[in-house]
Structure formats: structure tokens, C-alpha cells
């Protein structure tokens, strides 16, 4: 990780931007450091990578320096807490964040013993904050699932940390790939299960369409067909945004036919950017594209009480647009305009030529 022996406030803020933080006792003003076998409270100004923590998958708390997760040993719950392998089944690795308290199972919460070791106890309440963030709550950094693209697990979220090449990775990596694409494992041990997917990569927005996008040569638009994934509308929307794109908008019949052709072998319904999440605005494209072309299925019910607020595209239906409950899980298509051109320059817009 290359963390300096003492973390500057600026460096600390950089880590916090990545969801990595130092846990400080609100009352004692000291910070949790992971040692070889126990956790202790130390001077926060001597912050080092063994003081850096990150919320990971399955409510885990991962220590960067120690490459392990905070665990509660049920056979000796009052003993000082320690780090364990993050997929250990011998201890409880799940922690909840609640009003500055870190709580485990059976009402155990993270406390401090008289000797400055960190223990789990039911007796007292101890409050923890994020050091260097002006008393900020460590709950602000809670883990959010990062859904994969392509790969072999149909859009399953990354498992953090995952072990690859004898190292525990708490974020996506480019390691082991000649094409330099970001990836993660979707189970805790890559070599054992070989389950993986690409990660949404914001930097890929700069280079245009890499191998996980398909380019329409006529329009300078790239599409990503996630036809085996199964995400809610908002998860799909986030996945596209994280890659510098948006959920699919359809500006004309030419674009619709391009999408149809690329889905021809699949009888599938996919999320597109059409939504009425703003009830005052009704149906809109999430990328702001104006509604100059519509292809609603006649079966769609537009009565106000209908709670289907997100739009889908069905390649196997001529009237292809339908509405669905946004929490349904479906495949999805992302769209990205190349070269940062104002998308209204390249978005179809030639409908009168067809008539």
C-alpha cells in the first residue's frame, strides 16, 4: 500500500476518499492498531497502515496493514479482538455500525479494556469515530456492492477482500492481466473458484471503448451488453455511470435496430435509462436525451397508481418498451458517447431521412 510511517492529514483524506479510515475512540482520542495477535489503542498521530480499516463484503472490517478482518472468537468472546482470514468460518466476522458503535452478534460491541487492548463486551457502550475527519462517523464508509461486468458470474458483486496470487485485495486490481483491465473475484479465493468479472472503471471513460464495449461505427457511440447480469434498475444505472456511461437511451429507430441486432440470439428484456423516478416529470431518459422517439408497448398501463417506474427494452417484441418495478432484477445495456462530444451532435437525429 505504500503508506508512510506517519500519515499526513492530506494522505488521510485521500484514503478516506477510497473508503479507508482510521478508527479513533471518541472519548480516549486514541486509534485502533492491529498488532500480530491483538488490537491495541495507540497515538493517532503515529498512524500507519496497521491503523487503516475498510468496510468490506458481508459486513467485514478489513485491516489494510494486517491483511485480515476483525473477528470475534465465540469460544472466548471477552478475549482481546484479533484479525483473522476474511473467509474464516471459525469466528464471527460480521460487524454493524450503529450510532458510532461497532456491534457484532449477540449484542457484543467493540470496547477498550484497561490495558488499552480492544475487546468485545456487552457491558458498556464505546463510541468510535473516523480520525482526521472532524469527528465523522465511521458508518459513512460502509461497503457498497460493486457489480461486475462480463466475466463468468453474471454480474455478481465483487467479493472484497479476495485472495489472488497469495495477496488479499480490498479493491479491484489490474494484476495478472496483459490488457490492463480492472477486475475482481466474486468469491474470496480466486485460485480456488476462478469466479471473476471486470470492474466498472471510471478511467476507461478517457480511452473510449475498450474490449468490454461494442462500438457502433456509424454513430461514435459504444454499447455494453450485460445480457447475463441480473441487477435492479438503480444498480444497473450506477454500473453504467461508474464507467463514464449511462443506461441505454434510444433516440431513433436506427439505434433501436442496432440494439435489436446485437441481442438477436437472446430472448431477453433489459433495463434502459427510461424512468419516471421523478413523479413530477414523468417518463424521462436518465441521460437527458429528449423524448423525440417513442416505442411503448400498447400493453403498458400509464395510470397514476401503477408502480412500475422504470423502463425496459424487449428485443423480441416490435413495440419494445415496457415498464417494470425498478427493484426487479434484469440484464442491462450501457451506452457511452465517444470523445466527450456533446451527445446531441451524434445521437441519430435524422429521422426525416427515412420518410
Amino acid at each position: 500500500e505504500g503508506v508512510a510511517a506517519a500519515l499526513t492529514p492530506e494522505r488521510l483524506l485521500e484514503w478516506q476518499d477510497k473508503g479507508i479510515f482510521v478508527i479513533q475512540s471518541e472519548s480516549l482520542k486514541k486509534c485502533i492498531q492491529a498488532g500480530k495477535s491483538v488490537l491495541t489503542l495507540e497515538n493517532c498521530k503515529q498512524a500507519n497502515k496497521h491503523m487503516l480499516w475498510k468496510w468490506v463484503s458481508n459486513h467485514g472490517l478489513f485491516n489494510i496493514g494486517g491483511s485480515g478482518c476483525l473477528g470475534l472468537n465465540f469460544s472466548a468472546p471477552e478475549q482481546p479482538l484479533s484479525l483473522y482470514e476474511c473467509d474464516s468460518t471459525l469466528v464471527s466476522l460480521r460487524w454493524r455500525c450503529n450510532r458510532k458503535m461497532i456491534t457484532g452478534p449477540l449484542q457484543y460491541s467493540v470496547q477498550v479494556a484497561h490495558d488499552n487492548t480492544v475487546v468485545a463486551s456487552r457491558k458498556y457502550i464505546h463510541k468510535w469515530i473516523s480520525y482526521g475527519s472532524g469527528g465523522g462517523d465511521i458508518c459513512e464508509y460502509l461497503h457498497k456492492d460493486l457489480h461486475t461486468i462480463k466475466g463468468n458470474t453474471h454480474g455478481m458483486p465483487c467479493m472484497f477482500p479476495f485472495q489472488y496470487n497469495h495477496q488479499w485485495h480490498h479493491e479491484c486490481t489490474r494484476e495478472g492481466r496483459e490488457d490492463d483491465l480492472l477486475w475482481c473475484a466474486t468469491t474470496s479465493r480466486y485460485e480456488r473458484d476462478e469466479k471473476w468479472g471486470f470492474c466498472p472503471d471510471p478511467t476507461s471513460a478517457e480511452v473510449g471503448c475498450d474490449t468490454i464495449w461494442e462500438k457502433d461505427l456509424n454513430s461514435h457511440i459504444c454499447y455494453q451488453f450485460n445480457l447475463l447480469s441480473s441487477l435492479s434498475w438503480s444498480e444497473a444505472h450506477s454500473s453504467c455511470q461508474m464507467q463514464g456511461g449511462t443506461l441505454l437511451s434510444i433516440t431513433d429507430e436506427t439505434e433501436e435496430n442496432f440494439i435489436r441486432e446485437h441481442m438477436s440470439s437472446k430472448t431477453v428484456e433489459v433495463w434502459m435509462g427510461l424512468n419516471q423516478l421523478d413523479e413530477h416529470a414523468g417518463w424521462q431518459w436518465s441521460d437527458g436525451t429528449p423524448l423525440n422517439y417513442l416505442n411503448w408497448s400498447p400493453e403498458v398501463n400509464f395510470e397514476p397508481f401503477v408502480e412500475d417506474h422504470c423502463g425496459t427494452f424487449s428485443s423480441f417484441m416490435p413495440s419494445a418498451w415496457r415498464s417494470r418495478d425498478c427493484e426487479s432484477t434484469l440484464p442491462y445495456i450501457c451506452k457511452k458517447y465517444l470523445n466527450h462530444i456533446d451527445h446531441e451532435i451524434v445521437e441519430g437525429g435524422h429521422h426525416h431521412h427515412h420518410h
Epitope: Y293, L294, W296
Partner: antibody
Amino acid sequence: QVQLLESGPGLVKPSETLSLTCTVSGDSISNYFWSWIRQSPGKGLEWIGYIHYSGTVSYNPSLRSRVTISIDTSKNQFSLKLSSVTAADTAVYYCARRGRIAAAGTGYYYYGMDVWGQGTTVTVSS
Amino acid sequence: EIVMTQSPATLSLSPGERATLSCRASQSVSNYLAWYQQKPGQAPRLLIYGASSRATGIPDRFSGSGSGTDFTLTISRLEPEDFAVYYCQQYGSSLWTFGQGTKVEIK
């Protein structure tokens, strides 16, 4: 042949709400986008907003806080409400239909406003 | 919000002459542009949509061109009934806007 007819009071007091209705005859209101436009005396056209029966609406940002456009498919009508009016809202108010063309498949392209009402003059005065 | 600017504000021409009206958008609207004609005391009438397609019943002396930000309405030979105010309107954004109008008057 499609016809649009605006109706509503010609005189509204300052700070009150202006309410106009546009009655559509000759076609189903469900097939199109419908719009309101106004024109102050001696001035140009100002777009107020549009609505589609699916629920899609869009309003001129300068009027958004005061305007509501609604649609009643059972009566084949759509309406405009403009609250907290002042003398600056004195204008001829037009309702209009947005034209459409069938695509080669099952979709439709929508374009400019191809059918207009004759307009109704609204004066804001006490 | 996309601002539409029309020029000139007034065009003084004689019947039979060619009229060229300009409309410029503050950002690209692709070809999502319409032209309207308005005579005193009347509602506007759609002339052109999609920047260059003539609306139903519009004589072929009216033609539109342009794409992106610059558009032109041309009346090849002015007839007496063509003297009116002409407006452009963009629908390349969900927030529609009109130009301020060009008045074509008899010289």
C-alpha cells in the same frame, strides 16, 4: 380533422391562479404530446410546457415553480394552471399538438407543433 | 437551457425576391428544429420540422437546412402572403425554446 379549443377566464386578478383548458376533438389525446405556448402583447412566442399521457411533462424553467399541466384522457382535455400571476402574465395563450410520424416499425417520431388552437387572451388586472 | 438567436430581426424584401432567415442554437440540437410562420391575429403555423422536412400543405418555395447549431429557412420567391413573422424552435432538449423571431416585411 383535429381541432383544439382553449377555454377559461379572460380576466384574472393578480396573485390568483390562471386556469385554462384545451379540448381536443378529432383524435385521441393519448396519441400525442400536448403543449402550452404564450405570447405577450407585441412579443415573441414563449414555450410554457408539454405533457404526454404516459405522464411525461416538461416545463419552462422560468415558470416551473408556478406552472402545472395535467391531462384528462376521459374528457380528451389537457389543462394549464399558472399560480401567483402578475401583469407580466398577460398574454395570448395557445394550446398545441406536437406532430408525429410513424417509424418503419412500431415507434413514432415526434417533432414540432403541427396543430394549434386559435388562442385565448388572458389579462391579469385587478 | 438552449438559447435560439434569429437574424436578422427584420428583413425588408419585395415580392418575388429570395428570403434567407438564420437561426443559431447556443449548443447542438442535432436536427431537432422547427420553423413557424405567424401572421397578425393568428396562431403560428408549422412550416418545417426536422430542420428540413416540410409540414403537410406547405408550398415547396419554403425550404429548411442546417444541423447542429446553424439553421436556415429559405423562401425562394416571396409571395404576398409570405410577409409575416417567422420563428425557429428547438426540441433537441427536453426544455424547448423559441427564437425571438424575424419579421419579413414588404420593402
